[in-house]
């Protein structure tokens, strides 16, 4: 699927990967944080509250119905209202030690300020990204991956660890985001919503997609996590949506097959090692790029972000199991374990390719709204 | 730097209890608070096993050998895991390592525990 005046790049193709330019230009909203299309009620960013991370509401889940299928991007624009009242998810909160207010979850109470104050800070993730707004970086090169593709054995620890899935990733899995800028890969998990709802973190012109990947990588100028936390450029995620395609994705079924072993929270299985490069995009040349932070508490900023354009394709039966099979704290399904859109607060996303110039008739000649910042690098 | 520490291993007769204590020591040690607590335990000879962990929301989960005999626990304001073991065999003979999962795994040193007569 492509938005209204995509650039006309052919699709590359290969491995897990869906449409070449998923992220288009779309009429802009007025307002830089207006409403965006299937974020949580009560998140909206109204003007005056740009500086509340607002993690009090989520959506509330609708009933379910069979492979009800996901949001089109020529659906686009549209701002859904709320679901239908239902009990929201994650809200039997499982609080053993009375008032702790470590024990997280999305939606309701502790809200996360008072879990970790860095919740609150001025340049947190997700946000929305809006291409006509990006600034095209050409400084910006290819992402490079190295050892990504894994031998059988060892095998991976695949835990559900209440929140998300998460595939621990063993030594060796080098990224670098360019000359000098290297990370080694941690560990990958997942983002997603319910039946017919949608559960990406990121969104794109207030488009949610229906999951994401996160791929964490720490930088080589650390040895571990706790001394990079909320140093600028310590962390880095290589993020991908995910979309509904009609065939079965099989880099994601190796994981997804194996998803009911670990139903329960806290249960862990273990896989074969996989080619984790396949659960990306192919192109790895054209990405938007930010600052932000980690996405659940502690929600340390300094993170670096980098966004494929490019999409990976899953079948709705996957994209069903993916977001029906889980449970978490309390009993309730592990579902739309997504945060918020959160506000730029004056942050330029940077865009490998010209993401914003507008080459459709209707233009008299390319608008590119904001400069890149390293461009002189 | 983050260090884990184990405590409370030792030589125990069959049916006997031990409470093992693992401790977060280090300038960011409030990181632990959001990770998955586990332990572990390798026998000799024998790949390392997982036997509980305890999630940052408190959810729970142990391995079918000692279901019902231990318990693994959180104290987040004093950054501990426990685990009590109770009914202990023999085949509980290992050394028990602590282990926190956030974004990467952290390792303890390990403790050793007998269960012999």
């Known amino acids: 699927q492509r938005l209204p005046r995509m650039q006309e790049d052919s699709p590359l193709g290969g491995g897990s990967s869906g449409e070449d330019d998923p992220l288009g230009e779309e009429d802009l909203p007025s307002e830089e944080d207006s409403p965006r299309e299937e974020d949580p009620p009560g998140e909206e960013d109204l003007p005056g509250e740009e500086d509340l991370p607002g993690e009090e509401d989520l959506p509330e889940v609708k009933p379910k119905s069979e492979e009800e299928g996901s949001l089109k991007l020529e659906d686009l624009p549209t701002v859904e209202a709320p679901g239908d009242p239902q009990e929201p998810q994650n809200n039997a909160h499982r609080d053993k030690e009375g008032d702790d207010q470590s024990h997280w979850r999305y939606g309701g109470d502790p809200p996360w300020p008072r879990v970790s104050p860095a919740c609150a800070g001025r340049f947190q993730s997700p946000v929305d990204i809006r291409p006509q707004l990006a600034a095209f970086c050409p400084a910006l090169r290819p992402l490079e991956l190295l050892g990504f593709q894994l031998p059988p054995l060892p095998e991976l620890r695949l835990r559900n660890n209440g929140h998300s899935v998460q595939l621990t990733l063993p030594p060796g899995l080098e990224m670098a985001l360019g000359p000098g800028r290297e990370y080694r890969a941690l560990q990958l998990h997942l983002h997603w919503g319910a039946a017919g709802r949608p559960g990406s973190e990121h969104t794109v012109e207030g488009h949610r997609f229906p999951a994401e990947i996160h791929v964490v990588h720490l930088s080589t100028a650390f040895a571990r996590v706790d001394e990079a936390l909320g140093r600028p450029g310590g962390l880095a995620v290589l993020a991908a949506f995910l979309e509904e395609g009609p065939e079965e994705n099989s880099a994601y079924e190796q994981l997804l097959s194996r998803l009911e072993e670990i139903a329960e929270e806290g249960s862990e299985t273990q896989v074969p090692g996989l080619d984790i490069s396949a659960l990306l995009p192919s192109d790895f040349s054209r990405y938007f790029q930010y600052e932000g932070s980690l996405t659940t508490p502690p929600c340390a900023q300094g993170v670096i972000w980098t966004v494929f354009n490019q999409t990976v394709m899953l079948s709705a039966k996957q994209l069903h199991t993916l977001s029906d099979t889980l449970w978490g704290p309390g009993d309730s399904r592990l579902q739309l374990n997504f945060r918020a859109t959160q506000p730029l607060n004056g942050r330029v996303i940077e865009a490998s390719f010209p993401a914003g110039v507008d080459s459709s008739p209707r233009a008299a000649e390319p608008v590119q709204l904001n400069s890149c910042l390293a461009a002189g690098d | 730097q983050v260090q884990l520490q184990e405590s409370g291993g030792g030589l125990v007769q069959p049916g006997g209890s031990l409470r093992l204590s693992c401790a977060a020591s280090?300038?960011?040690?409030?990181?632990?608070?959001?990770?998955?607590m586990a332990w572990y335990r390798q026998a000799p000879g024998k790949q390392r096993e997982l036997v509980a962990v305890i999630t940052s929301a408190g959810g729970t989960k142990y391995s079918d050998s000692v279901k019902g005999r231990f318990t693994i626990s959180r104290d987040n304001a004093k950054n501990t895991v426990l685990l009590q073991m109770n009914s202990l065999k023999p085949e509980d003979t290992a050394v028990y390592y602590c282990?926190?999962?956030?974004?990467?795994?952290?390792w303890g040193q390990g403790t050793q525990v007998t269960v012999s007569s």
């Open positions: 280090g300038n960011s040690v409030n990181i632990f608070r959001f990770a998955a």
């Open positions: 282990n926190a999962d956030y974004l990467q795994d952290y």
